[in-house]
């Protein structure tokens, strides 16, 4: 009778075990072990017992002890069970961002591991078990479906294997996959709202605002604002589930024409975009051209108003004939025209919007000098010893210099308060002089003495 000890062994993969083969007869012709495993016999006294060290046990095996005794040959098997934890426990890769409301399939793959009867695969969210199944197949695969919720944001999903050898007197061996951190998001189906000027003048700045409500998590939303090829740099303000991105846009002559303004919101692996057209235009103020800004009285003056070729102008409120970018008027300069304003108003329609510009120029008319009865009376009669102010106003542009002299030397104190004396009596020659020439006028002062009263 052949016996083996131990009859059952559970050992780690690659491990070694001592197996004792014994026989019941004292003088066996033969006592040994049959196994493909590397073996080393340990020397023991006696003939009816042999101890073997079996090493590098890689898989389940059934070494067989045999003996040949006078009463016949017999065998006994020992059952070696190899245990090892899986070589690979992995969650199938998934995009880290998942939209709320989507069904997410978690797939765990397990390679290796034994004994399979004691191996379980567990899918978890955090520490919460989602699914538990025995490992079947190579590789073993366990799947579960999760409806993505907002509160799953940042949750860690993992896969764990449990090799439970506690019934065999060993422990519970656990292997866990690298976690998959779920980023959930909500990007509404409505495109972002874009508020911007429809038209923008060259060399000016405009403000563009792009906003969107109903985002989650709003802080992760990326906003891209661009005008044509020009990327704008917005300042983004966040609300609970909304953002508002505000940017300044500067345009130059190179941008002239119709440009595409885009606002793109990217969240997770989705995006929403709004497009708008902005017309960049150049509209210099209209030109008011006077043949000469300063003319002498009686000169013919042409006033021209010129604007952008597509503009419509009015000159002093009078429309161009025909309607268009040019208007003009002719006039003979009079003193009344001195300081007269000529206003050119231009209206340009840009993409349906009306833009207004204006320019005004003043005409200077040189005239005079003038000395007339109204402003410089030819006769004054004043009582002696009375207080009087001689008045004589010369007109002209430039304003003339005025002097009134009696006998070429004695001045009349124009504009000054004087006490009338006999010396003041006489005829004065008033001379008004400017770059435009000179005029003279005789002024007589009569002094009434008290004896004539």
């Amino acid at each position: 009778q052949t016996s083996v000890s131990p009859s059952k062994v559970i050992l780690p993969r690659g491990g070694s075990v001592l197996v004792t083969c014994s026989t019941s007869c004292d003088q066996p012709k033969l006592l040994g072990i049959e196994t493909p495993l590397p073996k080393k016999e340990l020397l023991l006294p006696g003939n009816n017992r042999k101890v073997y060290e079996l090493s590098n046990v890689q898989e389940d095996s059934q070494p067989m002890c045999y003996s040949n005794c006078p009463d016949g040959q017999s065998t006994a098997k020992t059952f070696l069970t190899v245990y090892w934890t899986p070589e690979r426990v992995e969650l199938a890769p998934l995009p880290s961002w998942q939209p709320v409301g989507k069904n997410l399939t978690l797939r765990c793959q397990v390679e290796g591991g034994a004994p399979r009867a004691n191996l379980t695969v567990v899918l978890l969210r955090g520490e919460k078990e989602l699914k538990r199944e025995p490992a079947v197949g190579e590789p073993a695969e366990v799947t579960t479906t999760v409806l993505v919720r907002r509160d799953h944001h940042g949750a860690n999903f993992s896969c764990r294997t449990e090799l439970d050898l506690r019934p065999q007197g060993l422990e519970l061996f656990e292997n866990t996959s690298a976690p998959y951190q779920l980023q959930t998001f909500v990007l509404p189906a409505t495109p972002p709202q874009l508020v911007s000027p429809r038209v923008l003048e060259v060399d000016t700045q405009g403000t563009v605002v792009c906003s969107l409500d109903g985002l989650f998590p709003v802080s992760e939303a990326q906003v891209h604002l661009a005008l044509g090829d020009q990327r704008l740099n917005p300042t983004v303000t966040y609300g609970n589930d909304s953002f508002s991105a505000k940017a300044s846009v500067s345009v130059t002559a190179e941008d002239e024409g119709t440009q595409r303004l885009t606002c793109a919101v990217i969240l997770g692996n989705q995006s929403q975009e709004t497009l708008q057209t902005v017309t960049i235009y150049s509209f210099p103020a209209p030109n008011v051209i006077l043949t000469k800004p300063e003319v002498s009285e009686g000169t013919e003056v042409t006033v021209k108003c010129e604007a952008h070729p597509r503009a419509k102008v009015t000159l002093n409120g009078v429309p161009a004939q025909p309607l268009g970018p040019r208007a003009q008027l002719l006039l003979k300069a009079t003193p009344e025209d001195n300081g007269r304003s000529f206003s050119c108003s231009a209206t340009l329609e840009v993409a349906g919007q009306l833009i207004h510009k204006n320019q005004t120029r003043e005409l200077r008319v040189l005239y005079g000098p003038r000395l007339d009865e109204r402003d410089c009376p030819g006769n004054w009669t004043w009582p002696e010893n009375s207080q009087q102010t001689p008045m004589c106003q010369a007109w002209g542009n430039p304003l003339p210099e005025l002097k009134c002299l009696k006998d070429g030397t004695f001045p009349l104190p124009i504009g000054e308060s004087v006490t009338v004396t006999r010396d003041l009596e006489g005829t004065y020659l008033c001379r008004a002089r400017s770059t435009q020439g000179e005029v003279t006028r005789k002024v007589t002062v009569n002094v009434l003495s008290p004896r004539y009263e």
Epitope: K312, T314, G317, P322, L323, S345, T347, Q353, L354, N358
Partner: antibody, heavy 122, light 110 residues
Framework: QSVEESGGRLVTPGTPLTLTCTAS????????MSWVRQAPGKGLEWIGI?????NTYYASWAKGRFTISKTSTTVDLKITSPTTEDTATYFC???????????????????WGPGTLVTVSA | AYDMTQTPASMEVAVGGTVTIKCQAS??????LAWFQQKPGQPPKRLIY???TLASGVPSRFKGSGSGTQFTLTISGVQSDDAATYYC????????????FGGGTEVVVK
């Protein structure tokens, strides 16, 4: 100075229809002209405008559904594929004025036609 | 777009009373605003242009005011003939996608 619309009638859905606005006493070369419509019991709805230089602009809802064009004396509004929602009175209006104090032009519907009724029904 | 919001949508007023209609533009339209009166079966009639200028032949009981984004039409000493729908209209832009008219205010005179 006056404007008058014509061409309104009963049409079946999908049948293109062209309305005409005839201007008298002023030149279309100097004015912008707008088309406005009013569905029964509803408010005024601007459809679009044509400029003195033939530029056209449309309300967002009207784009692709209407086309405005003109000759020297008339402005046309084509309803490309009428639906029952297009049942309305269609007005044409002169839409351009000069503000004499500033010398600026602005949009101003100072002259209206009596309107023409379009009924779209199967 | 220059959205025009008109309030109220409708109102009742007694003969001799006062009507106040407000019109708000979503953006600055300066003084480029007109008010229209429309009676059933008739085209709109322009009452006021450039926010406050009375159109010729319009009684002085109609008064327009405001600039920028806030405008008001006031009818003082209302007469039965003033029963109509009133519209504001911006005269600043006719861009693609533009809103030109307010929603209208129906005035019923008792």
């Amino acid at each position: 100075q006056s404007v008058e619309e014509s061409g309104g009638r009963l049409v079946t859905p999908g049948t293109p229809l062209t309305l005409t606005c005839t201007a008298s006493g002023f030149s279309l070369n100097n004015y912008y002209m707008s088309w406005v419509r009013q569905a029964p019991g509803k408010g005024l709805e601007w459809i679009g405008i044509i400029s003195d230089s033939d530029n056209t602009y449309y309300a967002s809802w009207a784009k692709g559904r209407f086309t405005i064009s003109k000759t020297s004396t008339t402005v046309d509004l084509k309803i490309t594929s009428p639906t029952t929602e297009d049942t309305a009175t269609y007005f044409c209006a002169r839409d351009w004025s000069l503000d004499s104090s500033s010398g600026y032009y602005y949009y101003d519907m100072d002259l209206w036609g009596p309107g023409t009724l379009v009924t779209v029904s199967a | 777009a220059y959205d025009m919001t008109q309030t109220p949508a409708s109102m009742e007023v007694a003969v001799g009373g006062t009507v106040t209609i407000k019109c708000q533009a979503s953006q600055n339209i300066h003084s480029w605003l007109a008010w229209f009166q429309q009676k059933p079966g008739q085209p709109p009639k322009r009452l006021i242009y450039k926010a406050s200028t009375l159109a010729s032949g319009v009684p002085s009981r109609f008064k327009g005011s405001g600039s920028g984004t806030q405008f008001t039409l006031t009818i003082s000493g209302v007469q039965s003939d003033d029963a109509a729908t009133y519209y504001c209209q911006q005269g600043y832009s006719r861009s693609d996608g533009e809103h030109v008219f307010g929603g209208g205010t129906e005035v019923v005179v008792k």
